[in-house]
């Protein structure tokens, strides 16, 4: 039940990569805006995005204040210029969205080498720490703070000149791994967070090969 | 659930081929890498290779790189081991294993090739 | 390759004993050392990964220690299911490779 020609929201979807998170959902607003809240399972309701013919809501400024929290959000439908009306029960119509715990749940986005350093039949491989809007001390985390041993790194490693891959692990942001003088190699790196059992892996890096510019040689 | 279900051993020729699969169900292999073993009677466990099914990579070791092949079928939930040029000492039970990246959680039943004319 | 050397390769050991076997790599694995039992005509079962974590499930007697090149799996006190085949694997680069097995068999 609900106000004449509001209907509620369906298809509430969390959309979060490295903790940057918006709720999205449907239908697209005929005659009515929609305002979102979020809570904690034990906190009050906060509001957002208040009114709005979006169909989308930033709501990462909430979920980093404790990553490890689960959230669950709802979204009011309302009459475009009617906001005070209500359904029937009294209350205005909403849905709710699934529960959502980003430490659990977010994407990991897709990593990048930073750099690459060759020192004789040594290359060591150096991915970049994303910085997240996860905040401590009015400073920014990267992810490997967030997520400290919990995540890791995989590198794909190759010769140019041939298809045969090899592996290895990190759980810091570097890889140091033996290769043939003489040759290049390329590299792509995945993240993981093996504790997981959804979202438990990034899409790969993009190929970055020695002879270009992020590397560099010492004999 | 978690299942994973080897198929496709037998008695192979020497010179042969063989195609094996490893149906999973409980979880979608997406998620994870998917691993083959063998292990010959009455000798220790040998890996094979691995294969990321989102991403297609694959990596083997050395000594498989040039008869084996690691694929992977994601609507099928099913990954794949083929060898060629199969010979006597390619004999063993075959097995696929779930790997989270920290640990193989899961493996299969296993399935024996008996390479042989 | 990284090659694991694993010792003893078989030993006699009677309920209640405590049980040590040793895995040495041939350079740093940095823990990425995984242990497993076997049982005849049955798939391998993780006992501990990362060298040093209890893999769900395992009773705590299981445990394990070690870091760079030398791990252990220690059973403290031999059960009567415990008589198996236990393998260390490392996973930190591939090939992925194993030790050459340690078989417990009932004195």
């Known amino acids: 039940s609900g106000t004449t020609n509001t209907v509620a929201a369906y298809n509430l979807t969390w959309k979060s990569t490295n903790f940057k998170t918006i709720l999205e959902w449907e239908p697209k607003p005929v005659n009515q805006v929609y305002t979102v809240q979020i809570s904690t399972k034990s906190g009050d309701w906060k509001s957002k995005c208040f009114y709005t013919t979006d169909t989308e809501c930033d709501l990462t400024d909430e979920i980093v204040k404790d990553v490890k929290q689960t959230y669950l959000a709802r979204v009011f439908s309302y009459p475009a210029g009617n906001v005070e009306s209500t359904g029937s029960a009294g209350e205005p119509l909403y849905e709710n969205s699934p529960e959502f715990t980003p430490y659990l749940e977010t994407n990991l986005g897709q990593p990048t080498i930073q750099s690459f350093e060759q020192v004789g039949t040594k290359v060591n491989v150096t991915v970049e720490d994303e910085r997240t809007l996860v905040r401590r001390n009015n400073t920014f985390l990267s992810l490997r703070d967030v997520f400290g041993k919990d995540l890791i790194y995989t590198l794909y490693y190759w010769k140019s000149s041939s298809s045969g891959k090899k592996t290895a692990k990190t759980n810091t942001n570097e890889f140091l791994i033996d290769v043939d003088k003489g040759e290049n190699y390329c590299f792509s790196v995945q993240a993981v967070i093996p504790s997981r059992t959804v979202n438990r892996k990034s899409t790969d890096s993009p190929v970055e090969c020695m002879g270009q510019e992020k590397g560099e040689f010492r004999e | 659930e978690v299942q994973l279900v080897e198929s496709g051993g037998g008695l192979v020729q020497p010179g042969g081929s063989l195609r094996l699969s490893c149906a999973a169900s409980?979880?979608?292999?997406?998620?994870?890498?998917m691993h083959w073993w063998r292990q010959a009677p009455g000798k220790g466990l040998e890996w094979v290779g691995l294969i990321d099914p989102e991403q297609g990579n694959t990596i083997y070791d050395p000594k498989f790189q040039d008869r084996a092949t690691i694929s992977a079928d994601n609507s099928k939930n099913t990954a794949y081991l083929q060898m060629n040029s199969l010979r006597a000492e390619d004999t063993a039970v075959y097995y696929c294993a779930r790997d989270t990246a920290a640990y193989f959680d899961y493996h299969g039943q296993g399935t024996l090739v008996t390479v042989s004319s | 390759d990284i090659q694991m050397t694993q010792s003893p390769s078989s030993l006699s050991a009677s309920v209640g004993d405590r049980v040590t076997i040793t895995c040495r790599a041939s350079?740093?694995?940095?823990?990425?050392l995984n242990w497993y039992q076997q049982k005849p005509g049955k798939a391998p079962k993780v006992l501990i990964y990362?060298?040093?974590s209890l893999a769900e499930g395992v009773p705590s007697r299981f445990s394990g220690s070690g870091s760079g090149t030398d791990y252990t799996l220690t059973i403290s006190s031999l059960q009567p299911e415990d008589f198996a085949t236990y393998y260390c694997l490392q996973h930190g680069e591939s090939p992925w490779t194993l030790g050459q097995g340690t078989k417990v068999e009932i004195k």
């Open positions: 990362y060298a040093t």
């Open positions: 350079r740093d694995i940095k823990s990425y």
């Open positions: 409980g979880f979608n292999i997406k998620e994870y890498y």
